[in-house]
């Protein structure tokens, strides 16, 4: 059913982010005493290694484009302060129709 | 045919609770696809969104801020309803409340509305 | 809390006009907006969501435009029914707040 392919999603995009944040770091020379923010995957989306200051965009993540194909994506932010990644703005729920209960179930 | 309707005492006195609630046919209060809020509008504040319940797998709230530490939404699945309780309610709560369901499509937005209920708060 | 402004706050016009009613939010809110339409005694009815798309069952004399912090809701050839109090709606952060409102009334 949809709930078992968007499970499937969520694990491929999670390996998949787990590779791109390693070759951040790589070419970003961060490690895990650098100042700003690791990457990280937030059971959703995945974000990439930040400096402090940056304010980083990502678009909703694929599930969002299979149950809405026809449609702009919306987009989420985070900030890197020096006390780590901010909330993300729009929360999940309200730019993109779905928040991370849906992708645990 | 989605339709709410809408319960609950017209007049509340000063300290007491607020408790209305929303009937909901065409359409189940577990549905994963809608939220169910609760508006209210008044001369002073207009239209004012008070919060929201929704089922993804569990049940989540959210509250305004405004009304965050005297609100509680409940779903009622048996019935397929759910329900605003307003507490320590004072003259300034005196407003019409609408239930709403939302949907999504872009962005959330509010295609189903109660009746609306005038509750008026005075002793 | 995003603020949501409209204007005019109300405005006169004749069956058969083309009106043009204005929202700002105070931050920009992509278009994560809704337009409802409220006729005294009853509760609010949606007409256009999306900042521009046309909900089911609405006349396509009604559109909305805009995108960010401006947006509009134009009635082409205003009928009878339209006479009525019109609110936009922000939907991109919780709490949703609403504009207060203008009032389209008969010349």
């Known amino acids: 059913g949809s709930m078992a392919h968007s499970d499937g999603i969520f694990k491929k995009e999670q390996a998949m982010c787990l590779e791109k944040i390693q070759r951040a770091n790589e070419l970003m020379g961060f490690n895990d005493s650098s100042p700003g923010c690791p990457g990280m995957w937030d059971n959703i989306t995945c974000w990439k290694p930040a400096h402090v200051g940056e304010m980083v965009l990502v678009s909703c993540p694929e599930l969002f484009r299979i149950f809405n194909p026809d449609q702009d994506m919306g987009v989420v932010s985070r900030n890197c302060t020096e006390d780590g990644w901010s909330e993300p703005f729009p929360h999940y729920f309200d730019a993109c129709g779905f928040d991370e209960y849906e992708s645990e179930t | 045919q989605v339709q709410l309707q809408q319960s609950g005492p017209g007049l509340v006195k000063p300290s007491q609770t607020l408790s209305l609630t929303c009937a909901i046919s065409g359409d189940s209060v577990s549905s994963r696809y809608a939220t169910w809020n609760w508006i209210r509008q008044s001369p002073s504040r207009g239209l004012e969104w008070l919060g929201r319940?929704?089922?993804?797998?569990?049940?989540?709230?959210h509250y305004a801020v405004s009304v965050k530490s005297r609100i509680t939404i409940n779903p009622d699945t048996s019935k397929s309803q759910f329900s605003l309780q307003l507490n320590s309610v004072t003259p300034e709560d005196t407003a019409v409340y609408y239930c709403?369901?939302?949907?999504?499509?872009?962005?959330?937005?509010?295609?189903?509305w109660g009746q609306g209920t005038l509750v008026t708060v005075s002793s | 809390d995003i603020q949501m402004t409209q204007s005019p706050s109300s405005l006169s016009a004749s069956v058969g006009d083309r009106i043009t009613i204005t929202c700002r939010a105070s931050?920009?809110?992509?278009?994560?907006l809704s337009w409802y339409q409220q006729k005294p005694g009853k509760a609010p009815k949606l007409l256009i969501f999306?900042?521009?798309r046309l909900q089911s069952g609405i006349p396509s004399r009604f559109s909305g435009s805009g995108s960010g912090t401006d947006f509009t809701l134009t009635i082409n050839s205003l009928q009878p029914e339209d006479f009525a109090t019109y609110f936009c709606q922000q939907a991109i952060s919780i709490p949703y707040t609403f504009g207060p409102g203008t009032k389209v009334d008969i010349k």
């Open positions: 931050q920009p809110i992509s278009r994560y």
């Open positions: 319940t929704y089922y993804r797998g569990q049940w989540k709230n």
């Open positions: 999306a900042g521009q």
């Open positions: 709403a369901r939302g949907m999504w499509n872009q962005n959330w937005f509010l295609d189903h």
